[in-house]
C-alpha cells in the first residue's frame, strides 16, 4: 500500500514535469534507494546538478535567456571538481559562455545565481581577465588547460546551462 | 577633444583596393573598441566591421568577410580598413565611430566626418 | 540578425508640435532592466550624432526636447517641441548581440 501510493505520487510528479521536459532521465539514490533524481533527456549529471552544452552560438544574454526558457541558468561553477566534470563534455576548439558578468565594467563579477563572487574560487587563465569592455566570462582551453576568459557580451559563444536535479 | 579624422577614399574601379585610415586624436585610442560603418549614397547605415581595444577580436558582416581587414596601430592612434576585391555596392560614404561601452553592449559615441569610396569602371 | 525597422519612413511637423518615431526590433534587446537600443540624429552632408543611449539616457549636450522610452522589442524617440534644426534623418541601433544593426531610419521635415 506504503510502495503504491509512492508510485502513484511519482507518476503525477513525473506528468507535472512532462509538460516542461519530454524525457526524463532518472537514476535511484538515497540510503534505501528509494529516491528518483532526475535530469532531462540529454542533460548530464553530476553531484545534484543536471547541466547541457548548447552548440547554439548566441550573444551571452540571448545564451542566459535560453537556459532560463528550460528552467535553468547559465553554470555557476563553484569548485575545481564542477568544472573538470563539465569540460569533459567540451570541445577543445571552442569557447563556452559562463554565467559569470560584470556588467558595469568596474571588476565585480557577478553570477546569475546570485551566488557570491569568491575570488578564491575561480579558474581564470593567466592575466585574464584583462578588459573591462569584456564583460562576460567563457571557458576555453589554452595553454594545455581549461580556464576562463573575458570577452565581449555580444559575441555569439556556445554555451552550458545548468540546473537543479529534479527529484522524484 | 575626441576626434576622429577619415582619409584614402577615391575613385577605384570594380575589383580594385582601396585602404581606409582613421585618425585618432583626444583620447587614449587604445582603451576603445573602433568601428567601420558605411553609408551608401541616399541611403541608411552599414555596419561594416569592429576592432576590440586590445585588437584580440575582429567582425565582419557577410557582405564583406573575405574581402575588408580591420586593424589597428595603437602607438600611431590609428585605426585601418583594408578593402579588397571592390564591388560597385561597396560605393559608400566611410565613417569610423569610436565605441563605448554600456553594460552588455555598445553604442558609437564619436564619428568621424567620413571619406568617400566609389567603385565604378 | 535583429532586424530593426522604424516607421514612419518621413515626417513633417510643425515648430512646437511634438514628433514621434518608433523602433521595433525583431527580438527582445532588453536584458534585466537594460535596454541596448541607442538613437542618433543625421544632418544632411554630416556624420550621425548619438542623441539617447540605452533607450532612454540622454547624451551629454543633447537638448531635453529629446527623449527616448521603451523596452523588450518597441522604443520611441520623441523630440518635443520640435525646432527648425531638428530637420535630419534618425536611426535606432541595438547592440545586444553581433552583428550591430541599424533602422532604416526616419526623415523628419520641419513644416
Known amino acids: 500500500n506504503f510502495m503504491y501510493s509512492k508510485t502513484v505520487k511519482r507518476l503525477s510528479k513525473l506528468q507535472e514535469y512532462q509538460q516542461y521536459y519530454p524525457s526524463l532521465t532518472c537514476v535511484m539514490e538515497g540510503k534505501d534507494m528509494e529516491d528518483w533524481s532526475c535530469c532531462p533527456t540529454p542533460w548530464t549529471s553530476f553531484q545534484s546538478s543536471c547541466y547541457f552544452i548548447s552548440t547554439v552560438m548566441q550573444s551571452w544574454t540571448k545564451s542566459q535567456n535560453n537556459c532560463s526558457v528550460m528552467g535553468a541558468d547559465l553554470v555557476v561553477i563553484n569548485t575545481k571538481e564542477e568544472q573538470d566534470f563539465i569540460t569533459q563534455n567540451l570541445k577543445i576548439n571552442s569557447a563556452y559562455f559562463l554565467g559569470l558578468s560584470d556588467p558595469k565594467g568596474w571588476r565585480h563579477w557577478q553570477w546569475v545565481d546570485q551566488t557570491p563572487y569568491n575570488k578564491n574560487v575561480t579558474f581564470w587563465h593567466s592575466g585574464e581577465p584583462n578588459s573591462p569592455d569584456e564583460r562576460c566570462a567563457i571557458i576555453n582551453f589554452r595553454s594545455e588547460e581549461w580556464g576562463w576568459n573575458d570577452v565581449h557580451c555580444h559575441v555569439p559563444q556556445k554555451s552550458i546551462c545548468k540546473m537543479k536535479k529534479i527529484y522524484i | 577633444e575626441v576626434q576622429l579624422v577619415e582619409s584614402g577614399g577615391g575613385l577605384v574601379k570594380p575589383g580594385g583596393s582601396l585602404r581606409l585610415s582613421c585618425a585618432a586624436s583626444g583620447f587614449t585610442f587604445s582603451s576603445y573598441g573602433m568601428s567601420w560603418v558605411r553609408q551608401a549614397p541616399g541611403k541608411g547605415l552599414e555596419w561594416v566591421s569592429t576592432?576590440?581595444?586590445?585588437?584580440?577580436?575582429?567582425y565582419y558582416p557577410d557582405s564583406v568577410k573575405g574581402r575588408f581587414t580591420i586593424s589597428r596601430d595603437n602607438a600611431k592612434n590609428s585605426l585601418y580598413l583594408q578593402m579588397n576585391s571592390l564591388r560597385a555596392e561597396d560605393t559608400a560614404v566611410y565613417y569610423c565611430a569610436r565605441q563605448l561601452y554600456y553594460s552588455y553592449g555598445y553604442y558609437f559615441d564619436y564619428w568621424g566626418q567620413g571619406t568617400t569610396v566609389t567603385v565604378s569602371s | 540578425d535583429i532586424v530593426l525597422t522604424q516607421s514612419p519612413a518621413s515626417l513633417a511637423v510643425s515648430p512646437g508640435q511634438r514628433a514621434t518615431i518608433t523602433c521595433r526590433a525583431s527580438e527582445s534587446v532588453s536584458f534585466h532592466g537594460t535596454h541596448l537600443m541607442h538613437w542618433y540624429q543625421q544632418k544632411p552632408g554630416q556624420p550621425p550624432k548619438l542623441l539617447i543611449y540605452a533607450a532612454s539616457n540622454l547624451e551629454s549636450g543633447v537638448p531635453a526636447r529629446f527623449s527616448g522610452s521603451g523596452s523588450e522589442t518597441d522604443f520611441t524617440l520623441t523630440i518635443n517641441p520640435v525646432e527648425a534644426n531638428d530637420a535630419a534623418n534618425y536611426y535606432c541601433q541595438q547592440s545586444i548581440e553581433d552583428p550591430p544593426t541599424f533602422g532604416g531610419g526616419t526623415k523628419v521635415e520641419i513644416k
Open positions: 576592432i576590440s581595444s586590445g585588437d584580440s577580436y575582429t
